[in-house]
Amino acid sequence: YHGCPSECTCSRASQVECTGARIVAVPTPLPWNAMSLQILNTHITELNESPFLNISALIALRIEKNELSRITPGAFRNLGSLRYLSLANNKLQVLPIGLFQGLDSLESLLLSSNQLLQIQPAHFSQCSNLKELQLHGNHLEYIPDGAFDHLVGLTKLNLGKNSLTHISPRVFQHLGNLQVLRLYENRLTDIPMGTFDGLVNLQELALQQNQIGLLSPGLFHNNHNLQRLYLSNNHISQLPPSVFMQLPQLNRLTLFGNSLKELSPGIFGPMPNLRELWLYDNHISSLPDNVFSNLRQLQVLILSRNQISFISPGAFNGLTELRELSLHTNALQDLDGNVFRMLANLQNISLQNNRLRQLPGNIFANVNGLMAIQLQNNQLENLPLGIFDHLGKLCELRLYDNPWRCDSDILPLRNWLLLNQPRLGTDTVPVCFSPANVRGQSLIIINVNVAVPSVHVPEVPSYPETPWYPDTPSYPDTTSVSSTTELTSPVEDYTDLTTIQVTDDRSVWGMTQAQSG
């Protein structure tokens, strides 16, 4: 293979890989026809002048996870064909000016996970063909104006996980081709008006995990192609009325972990493509009519872990495509019977950890496709007759941790649970709270002969009017559905956001008989 160094492996495809702690300098001689060179996990601390001089055909160079702290300005001389250069996961604090000079073909430059303290306009002034620049995981405190002015072809810029406290409104002004801009996990407290105005092709903007308190009203007005906007884990306390008005392509918006107290009607939209809206961990106390009415394609709405005590009957108007609604861990005591009436496609609803004392009999009347209902840890003593009768797809119902009153009025609910037992999975059985003689007993095995007669209604009406799937030989298979009711953060579509997905505690919505018990 034209002379492969002993500490490296060389493949027929002109790929060279040099790894191991015993390597302390760039191995020589490298095969002249090498097109890809990887130097990984070595003890190389510096790159001297022209170590790659004889491999001018090189297209990709990865020098990652080393002890590299110093690079001579001429280290990459004669690599005019190089398209991909990664220096990620090293110990670089300073980049010499002119380091990338002559790399006329360079398209991807990865400098992430180093200790860079600053960048200057002269660093990248020669990289006119650069499409991707990764600078996340460094110690940058500011970006000087002009730093990216020559990178007119740049499509992806990652500045996340640095120490940026402010951004100049001019720093991105020439990046008209930029599609992805990541500024997550910095110390930004505000973003000046106009900062993103030049980013007319931007598709993703990641601003999560900063300290942003206010959003300028027109901050995103020029970003008509924006598809993903991450604003979670900031200090945003209010949303200017027009802040999201010009985002017709948006399909993911995260606002969880802020300090939002209220949502005004029309604040979201029109966003015909928005599929997911994450608003958990805020301080929202009520939801007015039509607050989400512009979100006609919304499928996931997460409002858990707020302080919601009131939901207007028309709050969810327009959400005809909603599949998952999470309202758990709020302060709800009552729900209007029509509040979910428009949610014809709803599959999963989580209402656990509230203060619900009762549910209207028609609460799920138009929501025929429900597969999972979480009602645990509320103040429910009984449920209305027939409340679940029409829910033929229901395969998870959680009712535990409620103060069930097991007088004769509970029999219809008990019977319903038993009738639907083979196709209704639950991990914890509801337990009687009152009267005292049955406290602590499972609701579905209470001795009905000693249950206290009801003081409410002498004759218990029928419940359900007809059991599910009457007169059928077997129950349909339970359906397993991906759970989002217990998610603590959405899954971003890139890995360097360091967000996590925590799935439901049993990882199932519907349990089969074999899994249950």
Partner: antibody
Framework: EVQLQQSGPELVKPGASVKMSCKAS????????IHWVKQMPGQGLEWIAY??????KYNEKFRGRATLTSDKSSSTAYMELNSLTSEDSAVYYC????????WGQGTTLTVSS | DIVLTQSPASLAVSLGQRATISCRAS??????????MNWFQQKPGQPPKLLIY???NQGSGVPARFSGSGSGTDFSLNIHPMEEDDTAMYFC?????????FGGGTRLEIK
Amino acid sequence: EVQLQQSGPELVKPGASVKMSCKASGYTFTSFVIHWVKQMPGQGLEWIAYIYNDGTKYNEKFRGRATLTSDKSSSTAYMELNSLTSEDSAVYYCARDFYFDYWGQGTTLTVSS
Amino acid sequence: DIVLTQSPASLAVSLGQRATISCRASESVDYYGISFMNWFQQKPGQPPKLLIYAASNQGSGVPARFSGSGSGTDFSLNIHPMEEDDTAMYFCQQSKEVPYTFGGGTRLEIK
């Protein structure tokens, strides 16, 4: 006091039908399931079906030959068996609730020509 | 269908002693964390009488000498101390899923 009173013995010819009853008292009829169970002479017990507020669930073995109905106004459950053969000769019980906590005294059916 | 196998088929126990009847299910009869296994006593010419429901809960008016235990697929009915009146047929039954099924029965008599 909870009671299930079943109709008297039946002697029918092969191929005929029979309808037996189970009248409930001492509790709210609509709050509980009523099961029907077959026991052939000197044999074990065999579950036929249940009825609850007009909804029914049958053992496949009896589907199409057993029909359960109820009359809420009189708190009475009924089971009709058709196309009878000698194998249907047995005592038929009605029982209450999912846990079969109260049983009727049984209706003896004899199928003979 | 879930098949229930009772053992022994017949059992003779001295007065005052312990009688133990076993019932094994072909698959688990647990659901909601509850075992849907019931036990019945039947005397000649009488309907069955519920003794134990949901594996270990005593039926109404059932003497304390009758107790049930078990979970999953293995269950037992214990009678202690044995009395003359306990001579009868005993059946286990699962109510986990349709069709509900009964064991073949155990004949218990005085030794």
